[in-house]
Interface confidence: medium
């Protein structure tokens, strides 16, 4: 229904706390370089204005769209051009072009220092002094680094952050309590960030239809007892919500997400038997819980999928007269029977089925032609199953760090032109798939591995798009979203690459490495490993093992030495010489 004042409507629906949080996220995602203090000032102004509109919907400017109001606020920032360059050109445009322009200037890799967690005591002091400001900083810092983070979910993580601090800051050993709990929140949030970026990429590149297909498959897996009409309704709603968030309509997105949670909880009987526990929670937790809900039990009496989609003589009539509904029904029926498949795989199967009908329904004997389609799915199913098997075996053998290194070598050989920091980030994230997925029960491994890898590879594509350097990466990234992972898996050593010349300074280290946290130490070593592969793309596994083993011993030895600086200065050149020889 239409409201006189959109901003008043959202303020009333969301409540002041969530309203302010979402406005802060919106501003932080649009203007990623502005300090917290500047954004919080704008947030307060917008909130005060919203309150005047709640009091009187006919007040001046209350009838303006939220994009107009937000855009006007952003464009009024002094020195906008000095800080943001061509983003300031957006301000010369009218809505909706102005908002589109802002969206195009979102930076997936902003030049910001990594978010450093303060030490426990300092954290607790500032949290206890002003919890609202502390959590505001958290929202700001995450949102500006992840300009597509799903806003209502970020509010949920802020709430989790709040819970952890409230609990741990009363403990005697604050650090022991905080570290593992905040690490867990951070890990979940980082995964959420890459997953949401993938959804926005899907929406931006391939439109709502592609996203809705993804949603139908996902919902059908989770709610196999729900009927197609119910699944379609849920998928349509989820598509709308994600479109809004990806498009910067964060207030509408959060409001609609809360509405969807309400609907699901009021209609549990026709959706899933697993929802009740979620439905007893407050709004943010409820939505999050529903988004992470376990699969309902598959109905026992499902007939073979072949009856409707292969054996029925009317298949071509069904396909011709209502393509989207028929293919949607196929995707629904196949997905509800296969919670053990990844969504990417299910979409590839649906695509294969569609291509088969396109071909066969134009032939003389369609049933004979499409009669073997289910058997033709087999290689498509086997490929990701083998990927999971070989990668999980490798992970179990090497552990997370060793597995990351194996992935790093593989991907540096596939795309040596890509910058080393990007390769290291991608390989570290891809390598985490082992810890995340390989320990799961067999039936959950494939969906976990492939859908996670797809999200990480999307991040690689997004970064590469900014500065394209590898034709192979461009080729994999510009194809269909569901074919990306198989495309990357199929890449081999890039034969066109001219090896990088050996630079001693790339492999020169100093005593500062000794005081780095383990994670930073690993990144230093992995950076060296990528550089080695760029120097010798065809180095054997044994050669790389020798050099990296030698390197690890060198660091270990010098960090234990009495005169560390001297050790690094004298032993370093020897290491470089030995490495060159080993790789010759």
């Amino acid at each position: 229904e239409a409201h006189k004042s959109e901003i008043a409507h959202r303020f009333k629906d969301l409540g002041e706390q969530h309203f302010k949080g979402l406005v802060l996220i919106a501003f932080s995602q649009y203007l990623q370089k502005c300090p917290y203090e500047e954004h919080i000032k704008l947030v307060q102004e917008v909130t005060d204005f919203a309150k005047t509109c709640v009091a009187d919907e006919n007040a001046e400017n209350c009838d303006k769209s939220i994009h107009t109001l937000f855009g006007d606020k952003l464009c009024a920032i002094p020195k906008l051009r000095d800080n943001y360059g061509e983003l300031a050109d957006c301000c010369a445009k009218q809505e909706p072009e102005r908002n589109e322009c802002f969206l195009q200037h979102k930076d997936d890799n902003p030049n910001l220092p990594p978010f450093q967690r303060p030490e426990a005591e300092a954290m607790c002091t500032s949290f206890q002094e002003n919890p609202t400001s502390f959590l505001g900083h958290y929202l700001h810092e995450v949102a500006r680094r992840h300009p597509y983070f799903y806003a209502p979910e970020l509010l949920y993580y802020a709430e989790k952050y709040n819970e952890v601090l409230t609990q741990c800051c009363t403990e005697s050993d604050k650090a022991a309590c905080l570290t593992p709990k905040l690490d867990a929140v951070k890990e979940k949030a980082l995964v959420a960030a890459v997953r949401q970026r993938m959804k926005c990429s899907s929406m931006q590149r391939f439109g709502e239809r592609a996203f809705k297909a993804w949603a139908v498959a996902r919902m059908s897996q989770r709610f196999p007892n729900a009927e197609f009409a119910e699944i379609t309704k849920l998928a349509t709603d989820v598509t709308k919500i994600n479109k809004e968030c990806c498009h910067g309509d964060l207030l509408e997105c959060a409001d609609d997400r809360a509405e969807l949670a309400k609907y699901m909880c009021e209609n549990q009987a026709t959706i899933s038997s697993k929802l009740q526990a979620c439905c007893d929670k407050p709004v943010l937790q409820k939505s999050q819980c529903l988004a992470e809900i376990e699969h309902d039990n598959i109905p026992a009496d499902l007939p073979s999928i072949a009856a409707d989609f292969v054996e029925d003589k009317e298949v071509c009539k069904n396909y011709a007269e209502a393509k989207d509904v028929f293919l949607g029904t196929f995707l629904y029926e196949y997905s509800r029977r296969h919670p053990d498949y990844s969504v990417s795989l299910l979409l590839r199967l649906a695509k294969k089925y569609e291509a088969t009908l396109e071909k066969c329904c134009a032939e003389g004997d369609p049933p004979a032609c499409y009669g073997t389609v289910l058997a033709e799915f087999q290689p498509l199913v086997e490929e990701p199953k083998n990927l999971v098997k070989t990668n999980c075996e490798l992970y179990e053998k090497l552990g997370e760090y060793g597995f990351q290194n194996a992935v790093l070598v593989r991907y540096t050989q596939k795309a040596p032109q890509v910058s080393t920091p990007t390769l290291v980030e991608a390989a570290r994230n891809l390598g985490r798939v082992g810890t995340k997925c390989c320990t799961l029960p067999e039936a959950q491994r494939l969906p976990c591995v492939e859908d996670y890898l797809s999200a990480i590879l999307n991040r690689l594509c997004v970064l590469h798009e900014k500065t394209p350097v590898s034709e192979k990466v461009t080729k994999c990234c510009s194809g269909s979203l569901v074919e990306r992972r198989p495309c990357f898996s199929a890449l081999t050593v890039d034969e066109t690459y001219v090896p990088k010349e050996f630079k001693a300074e790339t492999f020169t280290f100093h005593s500062d490495i000794c005081t780095l946290p383990d994670k930073e130490k690993q990144i230093k070593k992995q950076t060296a490993l990528a550089e080695l592969v760029k120097h010798k793309p065809k180095a054997t596994e044994d050669q790389l093992k020798t050099v990296m083993g030698d390197f690890a011993q060198f660091v270990d030895k010098c960090c234990k030495a009495a005169d560390k600086d001297n050790c690094f200065a004298t032993e370093g050149p020897n290491l470089v010489a030995r490495s060159k020889e080993a790789l010759a």
């Epitope: 009927e227 197609f228 007939p303 003589k313 069904n318 509904v325 029926e333």
Partner: nanobody, 126 residues
Framework: EVQLLESGGGLVQPGGSLRLSCAAS????????VAWFRQAPGKEREFVAG????????YYADSVKGRFTISRDNSKNTLYLQMNSLRPEDTAVYYC???????????????????WGQGTLVTVSS
């Protein structure tokens, strides 16, 4: 749950017409695939006509094409079968069946329909 109740059967002369109705409750009839089946004494139950849910795609058995018309009135939540040019071999008990879930797909396979009416007898005889 879907409840189905057929009516309109009876005795009719060859060449005559009848209109069968099937009133549905517990479900909107336009949301589900629905069909008419028939079973003659001592024979298997056979598909007569069907209509998809959400999309008005109609299907007919070859033996009734051009003579029978399936339709529905969503406001009355009722399915119809208009039978013209009736023949003695059309004599059977006519059943209405519903198949929620996959709305589009009206299968000719009786086993795929979970909901059935109790049937109405049609006798074509002079």
């Amino acid at each position: 749950e879907v409840q189905l109740l057929e009516s309109g059967g009876g005795l009719v002369q060859p060449g005559g017409s009848l209109r069968l109705s099937c009133a549905a409750s517990g479900r909107y009839i336009d949301e589900t695939a629905v069909a008419w089946f028939r079973q003659a004494p001592g024979k298997e139950r056979e598909f007569v006509a069907g209509i998809g849910g959400g999309v008005d795609i109609t299907y007919y058995a070859d033996s009734v094409k051009g003579r029978f018309t399936i339709s529905r009135d969503n406001s009355k939540n009722t399915l119809y079968l208009q039978m013209n040019s009736l023949r003695p071999e059309d004599t059977a008990v006519y059943y209405c069946a519903a198949r929620p879930g996959s709305p589009l797909i009206t299968s000719k396979v009786a086993d795929l329909y979970p909901y059935w009416g109790q049937g109405t007898l049609v006798t074509v005889s002079s």
